[in-house]
Amino acid sequence: HHHHHHHHHHSGGGGSGGGGSGGGGSKGVEPKTESERLAGTESPVREEPGEDFPAARRLYWDDLKRKLSEKLDSTDFTGTIKLLNENSYVPREAGSQKDENLALYVENQFREFKLSKVWRDQHFVKIQVKDSIGQNMVTIVQSNGNLDPVESPEGYVAFSKPTEVSGKLVHANFGTKKDFEELSYSVNGSLVIVRAGEITFAEKVANAQSFNAIGVLIYMDKNKFPVVEADLALFGHAHLGTGDPYTPGFPSFNHTQFPPSQSSGLPNIPVQTISRAAAEKLFGKMEGSCPARWNIDSSCKLELSQNQNVKLIVKNVLKEIKILNIFGVIKGFVEPDHYVVVGAQRDAWGPGAAKSGVGTALLLKLAQMFSDMVLKDGFQPSRSIIFASWSAGDFGSVGATEWLEGYLSSLHLKAFTYINLDKAVLGTSNFKVSASPLLYTLIEKTMQNVKHPVTGQFLYQDSNWASKVEKLTLDNAAFPFLAYSGIPAVSFCFCEDTDYPYLGTTMDTYKELIERIPELNKVARAAAEVAGQFVIKLTHDVELNLDYEMYNSKLLSFMKDLNQFKTDIRDMGLSLQWLYSARGDYFRATSRLTTDFHNAEKTNRFVMREINDRIMKVEYHFLSPYVSPRESPFRHIFWGSGSHTLSALVENLKLRQKNITAFNETLFRNQLALATWTIQGVANALSGDIWNIDNEF
């Protein structure tokens, strides 16, 4: 059930060469008229009203790339990954003593690295754990009423509805919407058994619920997860959202007065993970072979034999825990109030070597290397770099989302990119990436500069790579940054075409990881080089490395999708003229900004600040202003979820062609109008001051 379905890329990162470069250059100093807070910290810098950038020797891209590469060469990643897998830090479920132990270790390391400032945010959040007394249980109820125990699973699914259900059991493959639609039998009133993978647990449960299933069992089948241990337990969560589901849309700082509230993404049915052995025991009582197209092992069966039922008892309980997010910042030299955030999940239900150990090790090493580059090597990043260690990631990016919720109104004006380090090393064959289109150009440049750790070829092998990039998924910590906060985000991994089989299990150990990836240090080095080059490019250059022109092609492909429905739209007496106009305005705004940039005096920090401020707002303005962040947190019209998204609008139109009685025309009219005005809003924001906007629209 891991989430890196990013774009496949055969190649990768080893040594990034890079020749030296001398000479002077220019470095900007950013004026600010008032004290500003680094989100979650105070970091005001009142500055002199200044003229142009002072001419001082400046490290260039080649120098920095080489410095980073040299540091990477002498860094022991595996030692740190192994250290994080030691008993004092394992297992480290969110809020546990061992999670706190590791938090303190990270905090101390940040201090030792001499980051400009190190701090922590404390949150009180509700998670769901197994009851210490009552056991979760799966049982077969025979026709004569006899109970045949199947399993009292060691694993569980957080945020399941704690209840007891009985009914028929049917298989629904991965539990995708398509899987449910293609079943030859009804799941109404039945429990469903689904295999892990393809989509998140939360989506599986939501889909099952929408088809009126009464409960869900999740297991790892042998084909997708070729694990020898058939009794291996599995953990996950079922919240169709991120953050603390009991404080939706607002942060759970201790001083917040919580109104009683809960996320609409919590399931109304019980869900439980079971081992493969338990699943096979159930299949022994079931009939009907699973379709060949499922590509599933032969033990799979479709429906429980007549006159038998399955009983699922889930006794999970809510628990309030204290979590710590640990932060360290390297303060920027020019625009310290603008920052890139590099983050990694710290907690894990099991040992979490691949799930949170690698990311945390990368986070620590990157913090150390960049601090070193500043203190010893003369690197002067224009913008700040925040390193963040999140807790409760295993419960739906809780720590990260709580931080975002705490600073929702201002964060997008300050944090301009999020780089996710979670699960960055799961294999070696492919380099996969998911990101905001604003980062595609940066990603491409990086892939042209980083070599694959095993093949030695540059990661950039396919000029068409961007068209294969998959959307960030709900279980990726980068998702709330992009879809909730409107901050461009990127997540990447070195991984295989197959899922890493031990995520969310007690076998996610350093021992298994190094066995599966003997070149672990090299691969971790490559992952660090990718992230490191992102950081340098995003903080060093005078102009912000966010390619706002990339959304032109996204808008164009949306228009193409809509064009298929020209007749339907005309039949409703509607026109796409205004949408075309809004898209055209966006295109013109991007062209104008590019011209402004080319004509700008690069050494004039006021002009550059104004241009960068316009660029920084692009992603945020793709958040629909017409829905409430509390009811529909993922407001991004491209990457979010809900009726305000462009994909929902297209789906609604498809429904008109498929089943006109199910089509909601009023909803569609709203969707079209609001999408038009959201896109127009982005164009206006990019155009700059109000008097520069052509209001003939």
Partner: antibody, heavy 118, light 106 residues
Framework: QVQLQQSGAELVRPGTSVKISCKAS????????LGWVKQRPGHGLEWIGD????????YYNEKFKGKATLTADKSSSTAYMQLSSLASEDSAVYFC???????????WGQGTSVTVSS | ENVLTQSPAIMSASPGEKVTMTCSAS?????MNWYQQKSSTFPKLWIY???KLASGVPGRFSGSGSGKFYSLTISSMEAEDVATYYC?????????FGSGTKLEIK
């Protein structure tokens, strides 16, 4: 409350060594950098170097490499600075100071006077 | 090394007068700290991260600046402000202090 207690004044011969101490209390000794600063009579302040007692990681001002050696004893929460091959220009008051965020030296010892004289 | 030049070296001000002293660095820094030292005592942290006042420092003090140029200002001089003020950078090794500005009262 945070306190840094330094050892007493030293009168030493040229060419010899001296080891001055700085005992920390009131905070987690292993979690903060501890720096050393030199001040000659009537002169300004000079940063000598610092130590992170949790790992014994040290940084030195190039100018003081070979002259100063920084160590720390976790069990007694005490930091030490040994000055070797002493000469008259080493006569100064030496301060230890704890460093927090933004490398702000927020707590200081009272200073140890070292006089090098034959 | 990053040389910090403080000016003036010595200055005197009348009570109630506004006082500004500067610190210029030979290369950019991302923040500046200031210390106050009165004769025969250890230095005290006075301003950190360019503009934040250390605990117990009167509100008449302020700090500002960026890049290579920083300043400490006293809005209204008082007798107890007589001291030597040192700027300090921790942005790159070796960390360095300025030569100090000695503030006297007229």
């Amino acid at each position: 409350q945070v306190q840094l207690q330094q050892s007493g004044a030293e009168l030493v011969r040229p060419g010899t060594s001296v080891k001055i101490s700085c005992k920390a209390s009131g905070y987690a000794f292993t979690n903060y950098w501890l720096g050393w600063v030199k001040q000659r009579p009537g002169h300004g302040l000079e940063w000598i170097g610092d130590i992170f007692p949790g790992s014994d990681n040290t940084y030195y001002n190039e100018k003081f490499k070979g002259k100063a050696t920084l160590t720390a004893d976790k069990s007694s929460s005490t930091a030490y600075m040994q000055l070797s091959s002493l000469a008259s220009e080493d006569s100064a008051v030496y301060f230890c100071a704890r460093s927090g965020n933004f490398y702000a030296m927020d707590y200081w010892g009272q200073g140890t006077s070292v006089t090098v004289s034959s | 090394e990053n040389v910090l030049t403080q000016s003036p070296a010595i200055m005197s001000a009348s009570p109630g007068e506004k006082v500004t002293m500067t610190c210029s660095a030979s290369s950019s820094v991302n923040y500046m700290n200031w210390y106050q030292q009165k004769s025969s005592t250890f230095p005290k942290l006075w301003i950190y991260d360019t503009s934040k006042l250390a605990s117990g420092v009167p509100g008449r003090f302020s700090g500002s600046g960026s890049g290579k140029f920083y300043s400490l200002t006293i809005s209204s001089m008082e007798a107890e402000d007589v001291a030597t003020y040192y700027c300090f950078q921790g942005s790159g090794y070796p960390f360095t202090f300025g030569s100090g500005t000695k503030l006297e009262i007229k």
